[in-house]
Each structure stands twice: as structure tokens, then as C-alpha cells.
């Protein structure tokens, strides 16, 4: 089907939607994936919840947004921003970013186009 895209709506409404959802399960899920089951990452006590459970909770939270597909970029950027200070080195940043990019697919959403995850002004 051919479609001409009109306006996508405004980004401030996405920011409001992202603010309303709990992104912690997504952050925990990605951290678990890049840390394995290392005990050092226990600030959320993530060891008590299996990664697959966290993934499901993460997908459920993302689904809570009114327009999940359009607001996906803002959600991913917020996750990156939230976790930036916890990422200890450049390699960890790249690993986190790779996992974050895979998140939409894991939740059966399309990956967002034109989404710049380098949002932390060089901190990450």
C-alpha cells in the first residue's frame, strides 16, 4: 500500500508519554544482557528477576505508550540517558547501545528511523 506521511504529532507529547511509563525493566533487561549474571550490578537487585521476565515487563511498559511506534526513539534515548553514568567504559557504552537498538525488535516493534542514541552530550 502506498502512503504519504502527514505530520507525526509533536515530540513533546512523546516526552510526556515516555515520562509516564516505567523504563526500569528495560534498563534492567539490557544491563543483564551486557553484564551476564555478574553480581556487581546489583543496584536494582536484578538477580531476583530472570532476563526474559524483565524483557516481557519492558515490552509491556513500552506498549503502554499511546503511540509506541512513533515515540520509540524518545523512549530509547531516555533509557540511554538514564543509564549513561553507570556505563563504565567505551566498550560498555557500545554494548549497551547495541542491545538498546535490538530492543524494539525483541518487543515486535519496528526499529525507529532517524533515531540518534548519542544523546548525552559526549558523556556516553
Amino acid at each position: 500500500m502506498r502512503r504519504e506521511r502527514g505530520r507525526q504529532g509533536d515530540s513533546s507529547s512523546c516526552e510526556r508519554q515516555v515520562d509516564r511509563v516505567n523504563l526500569k525493566p528495560c534498563e534492567q533487561h539490557i544491563m543483564q544482557r551486557i553484564m551476564g549474571e555478574q553480581e556487581q550490578y546489583d543496584s536494582y537487585d536484578i538477580r531476583s528477576t530472570r532476563s526474559s521476565d524483565q524483557q516481557q515487563r519492558c515490552c509491556d511498559e513500552l506498549n503502554e505508550m499511546e503511540n509506541t511506534q512513533r515515540c520509540m526513539c524518545e523512549a530509547l534515548q531516555q533509557i540511554m540517558e538514564n543509564q549513561c553514568d553507570r556505563l563504565q567504559d567505551r566498550q560498555m557504552v557500545q554494548q549497551f547501545k547495541r542491545e538498546l537498538m535490538n530492543l524494539p525488535q525483541q518487543c515486535n516493534f519496528r526499529a525507529p528511523q532517524r533515531c540518534d542514541l548519542d544523546v548525552s552530550g559526549g558523556r556516553c
Epitope: R3, S11, R114
Partner: antibody, heavy 123, light 110 residues
Framework: EVQLVESGGALVQPGGSLRLSCAAS????????MTWIRQAPGKGLEWVAN????????DYLDSVRGRFNISRDNAKSVLYLQMNTLSADDTGVYYC????????????????WGQGILVTVSS | QSVLTQPPSVSAAPGQKVTISCSGT????????VSWYQQLPGTAPKLLIY???KRPSGIPDRFSGSKSGTSATLGITGLQTGDEADYYC???????????FGGGTKLTVL
Amino acid sequence: EVQLVESGGALVQPGGSLRLSCAASGFKFSTFYMTWIRQAPGKGLEWVANIKQDGSEKDYLDSVRGRFNISRDNAKSVLYLQMNTLSADDTGVYYCTRNGLQDSYSGDFFDHWGQGILVTVSS
Amino acid sequence: QSVLTQPPSVSAAPGQKVTISCSGTGSNIGHNYVSWYQQLPGTAPKLLIYDNTKRPSGIPDRFSGSKSGTSATLGITGLQTGDEADYYCATWDADLSAVLFGGGTKLTVL
């Protein structure tokens, strides 16, 4: 070598129509977004329209939406811009460009440009 | 008036360094990638920087790009007289569903 060659520019009266063509060669046309960009005399660059690889998605500058139609023929490697209800504000050089936008986590960028074709709308 | 704001002109002597800023908002530069173009007099524009910081092959490393928050910057070191041109930034705006160009900056090499 990548080449983009525009044609179809002309002097046209206000309210008139024109169709621009852009013949592409030197790359696999069907795998790239394509974009029209224009420049009024002595002014800056202004994006006009994007079209996805398979033609399924199109985006337009607000002031041309409903008047212009971007289309492509992947079999012939040709990009088109049908322009209707033209006004003096549409006068300028129109560039056909290859857009490097990929399917995710990348941005629009125009890595190859045609030489440009002049469209003049005047009575 | 362009939504992306660039200084109308900048100038510097040969061999010096110059920076050109491009200021936007959260719905454009803040969320999306920035590219930069050089337009020499009477010619079609040429891509200098894409995805904020990347250089296409053939573009010398005298040209660099960076982005922080809702602003982007093009840097040019070792200025040459051949760098005299108009420079434009561009990015996607998610609210407008459109590519935006800055108003352009005229670089003069003194």
C-alpha cells in the same frame, strides 16, 4: 561513477504544471531513498520531498503538499517530480539527490547531487 | 526564516580554524542526525559530514562535525582560500515530518 541528471526545467506561467525527471546511473537505484531539494535565486537550500526505496512512503514540504508528487520508476532508474499549481515561490534550481537514509538508526544525508535544473514561474 | 539557526557569515585567515554553529530544537537536532554541506559559488552542494560526525570518503580530516543537545557544530581547520563557500546544516524534524536546512553560513577566508 554515480550520476544524477535532471531534465524538464522550463519557464512556466503561474498556475501551470511541470514534470521534472532525474536519470540515475552508477549505483543500484532501487536500494536508496531519493530526494528533491530546491534553491531559490540567491537563497538557501530547501528540501522538497523524499521517497522511500520502493515508493511506499513519501514526505513533502508543507508548502508543496497536495501540489507536488514525487514518484520513481525503479526499472528505469528514474526519479520524477510532478509539480502542479505552480507559483512564483516555486522558482529556483531543483536538485535531484541520493539520500543515504537507511532503515533504522541513521539520518537523512545527500551524498550525490545532480547539476540542478532551473524552474522559472513567471507571467 | 529557517528553524535551524546558523550565523549568516564567519571569517578567518588562511591556516586558522573556524567553527560554524547550527542551533535547533528537541524535535530536530535533539533527536535526529545532522549533516553538513559545502556549496562553492555556482555549483551544486557537496556532502561534508553525515550522522553528526562521519566524513564521506574524499573529505579531508580538516572538516569535523559534532553535536551536543540541540546544537551541532562544523569545524574547519587549516583554512584555505578554496574553502570560501556557503555551508549548510540539515536534519530531520519529527514534528514536521520534513528535512530542515539551516539558513546557510558564508565563509570568507581573509
